[in-house]
Amino acid sequence: IRAEKAMVDGSWLDLAKRSKLEAQPFAHLTINATDIPSGSHKVSLSSWYHDRGWAKISNMTFSNGKLIVNQDGFYYLYANICFRHHETSGDLATEYLQLMVYVTKTSIKIPSSHTLMKGGSTKYWSGNSEFHFYSINVGGFFKLRSGEEISIEVSNPSLLDPDQDATYFGAFKVRDID
């Protein structure tokens, strides 16, 4: 009987752990290739998939191009942005490029915006080279409050690699705020 009770208690514990894990907020958003802005100026990327291919979201909200936090906590945020160009897709306007990504937090309660992470480089992409590629990966640990929004800005959006394994960002809650 004692063994049976221990087994029942154990399974309840597993279930409680599992349901807590399932409730942990996370998101992995991939670029929507059909709606990438053109040009070379810095823009906010507002069109992301949240429910197809590798993209998934749970206990977070995606709205108006922004990832919205629903639970206070410490989150790991990450972004991977790939830029590429092949001569068959056209010419480069300039061979000297600044290829950048900015991960930004916006607070609705106290209207303010902060760059949490940025990454990138200046590049020389010769017009005589058939193909160019450059990848940026940034990641960090941040305290986020419910209602805060995470968005992505990039330079040279017309050079973005539209594949789901190339251009994506996400977040997952690591622990509660004490």
């Epitope: 053109s38 040009g39 070379s40 068959t88 897709s89 010419d91 306007a93 005589n128 058939e130």
Partner: antibody, heavy 118, light 111 residues
């Protein structure tokens, strides 16, 4: 298919200016440099310069820097070349052109004949 | 500026014979493993037509009797068996470096 349609022949007086046009179709106008080439009667080809219609970046052969001005109207998918202070040396056929997907000038307009005469 | 010198300036070839045109650049037109030299045909009263791109690649729709070879500073356009419709002026052009430049042209006459 890619097409470049140029404006008609021009007859101009010495010292005057002319503005030639080149309407592009069959591709995204803002993603390729559009080039201009000069050919005097019975002579060879001379590269004048090029414009990137998106941001309007330009590049010129030194010889044509003060002679030609390249502009583009993105909404009309049309490139322009203005030639100023015309002399008899400017009498020529002017072509607009675009590279192929793998280099080399694969697409040419039909040419515009400019005649400078008093 | 890169100067392109074509030779000969004119050429007279019998039908069915081979025609060879040379283009020499004042400096190398090679970069990133490719030669940025192209060949054009121009018939009287017409716009030029691209025949060969990147030194040796046949442009779509161009007859296989046309071929290109060479690298760095020395390039050749060959017509293996000349036909009547090949009577025209031929130009080489480099786009390795701004400003792009053309050779002076070679006039091919059919005997």
């Amino acid at each position: 298919q890619v097409q470049l349609q140029q404006s008609g022949a021009e007859l101009a007086s010495p010292g005057a200016s002319v503005k030639l046009s080149c309407k592009a179709s069959g591709y995204t106008f803002t993603t390729y440099w559009l080039q201009w080439v000069k050919q005097r009667p019975g002579q060879g080809l001379e590269w004048i310069g090029a414009i990137y219609p998106g941001p309007g970046n330009t590049k010129y052969t030194q010889k044509f820097k003060d002679k030609a001005t390249l502009t583009a109207d993105k909404s009309a998918s049309t490139a322009y070349m203005q030639l100023n202070s015309l002399t008899s040396e400017d009498s020529a056929v002017y072509y607009c052109a675009r590279r192929g997907s793998r280099r080399g000038i694969a697409y040419w307009g039909q040419g515009t004949l400019v005649t400078v005469s008093a | 500026n890169i100067v392109l010198t074509q030779s000969p300036a004119s050429l007279s070839v019998s039908l069915g014979q081979r025609a060879t045109i040379s283009c020499r650049a004042s400096e190398s037109v090679d970069s990133y493993g490719r030669s940025f030299m192209h060949w054009y045909q121009q018939r009287p009263g017409q716009a030029p037509r691209l025949l060969i791109y990147l030194a040796s690649n046949l442009e779509s729709g161009v007859p296989a009797r046309f071929s290109g070879s060479g690298s760095r500073t020395d390039f050749t356009l060959t017509i293996s068996s000349v036909e009547a419709e090949d009577e025209a002026t031929y130009y080489c052009q480099q786009d390795n470096e701004d400003p792009y430049t053309f050779g002076g042209g070679t006039k091919l006459e059919i005997k």
